[in-house]
């Protein structure tokens, strides 16, 4: 059973992940807005189901494409270089989803733009955080 300290740690990691994803979304939306149209040509795969920490496997698999899109953006919109930002997210995702069980991600049929993708994972983080508090 999860202890209060492990729950607290999970909550803090999720809050960190949430802040990173929100920072990316804000950076993109500040990106001379219509220049965003070039970033919207990239498509992202969405999880068929995202209700548990193990489903973060689906986010992990999309981090490389996310980094490629962020490389289109001007660095001044982010405090960190895309590579460092994605590396930080990857570390948190790996810790959160754990490595004990191998989970095969199932993707929905519909693909998404970078904005829809980020909003989906922001909602996921908020939902899990709310169950922990």
């Amino acid at each position: 059973a999860p202890t209060s300290s492990s729950t607290k740690k999970t909550q803090l990691q999720l809050e960190h992940l949430l802040l990173d994803l929100q920072m990316i979304l804000n950076g993109i939306n500040n990106y001379k807005n219509p220049k965003l149209t070039r970033m919207l040509t990239f498509k992202f795969y969405m999880p068929k189901k995202a209700t548990e920490l193990k489903h973060l496997q689906c986010l992990e698999e999309e981090l490389k494409p996310l980094e490629e899109v962020l490389n289109l953006a001007q660095s001044k919109n982010f405090h960190l270089r895309p590579r460092d930002l994605i590396s930080n997210i990857n570390v948190i995702v790996l810790e959160l989803k754990g490595s004990e069980t191998t989970f095969m991600c199932e993707y929905a049929d519909e693909t998404a733009t970078i904005v829809e993708f980020l909003n989906r994972w922001i909602t996921f983080c908020q939902s899990i955080i709310s169950t922990l508090t």
């Epitope: 001379k32 220049k35 070039r38 040509t41 990239f42 498509k43």
Partner: antibody, heavy 116, light 108 residues
Amino acid sequence: QMQLVQSGAEVKKPGESLEISCEGSGYSFSTYWIGWVRQMPGKGLEWMGIIYPDDSDTRYSPSFQGQVTISADKSISTAYLQWSSLKASDTAVYYCARGGGPFDYWGQGTLVTVSS
Amino acid sequence: SYELTQPPSVSVSPGQTARITCSGDALPRKFAYWYQQKSGQAPVMVIYEDSKRPPGIPERFSGSSSGTMATLTITGAQVEDEADYYCYSTDSGGDVSVFGGGTKLTVL
């Protein structure tokens, strides 16, 4: 309403220079990419390149890099396509269009004829 | 340089379903867009982001994408749908865009 109005048809000789224009109205011209598309007689559409008027950030298709120059003057909401030395193979209809990814609005097209 | 490949022509009878394909190596990661161009006119977008229809485009136009192939489907093609259709996308880096070679749709 949103409009892109292009300059009129041109007839030129090989080796001459040319600049055609595209004036945008009904939207914030400086903060939308503007692109140019070539259509040779009886042929398909070819993406030439795009410019972001606010800072003149420009991207060219490898096929058109060095062959044409795309520029913009945001103070008069106008984009330009220039040739320094025309060739007969430049004969085509040239469209300007708004958008960095897909093009959502198009000009009426400018016919450029290059013939000796 | 990046290429999108389309069949040169597709013919259907009125009321039949027309399918126009577009293949490109980057399409698993890049959205496809479709333009209709009638003779002597500027192109008009009929599908964006693989499968979405802009306002004013009839419901008979639909789009899909799987792997390296995007498809424009016209269910119950009408005579007024006779036109050239172009797929459009960007290369894997997102910097350069490209049109397919175009498909002439004949509805007879």
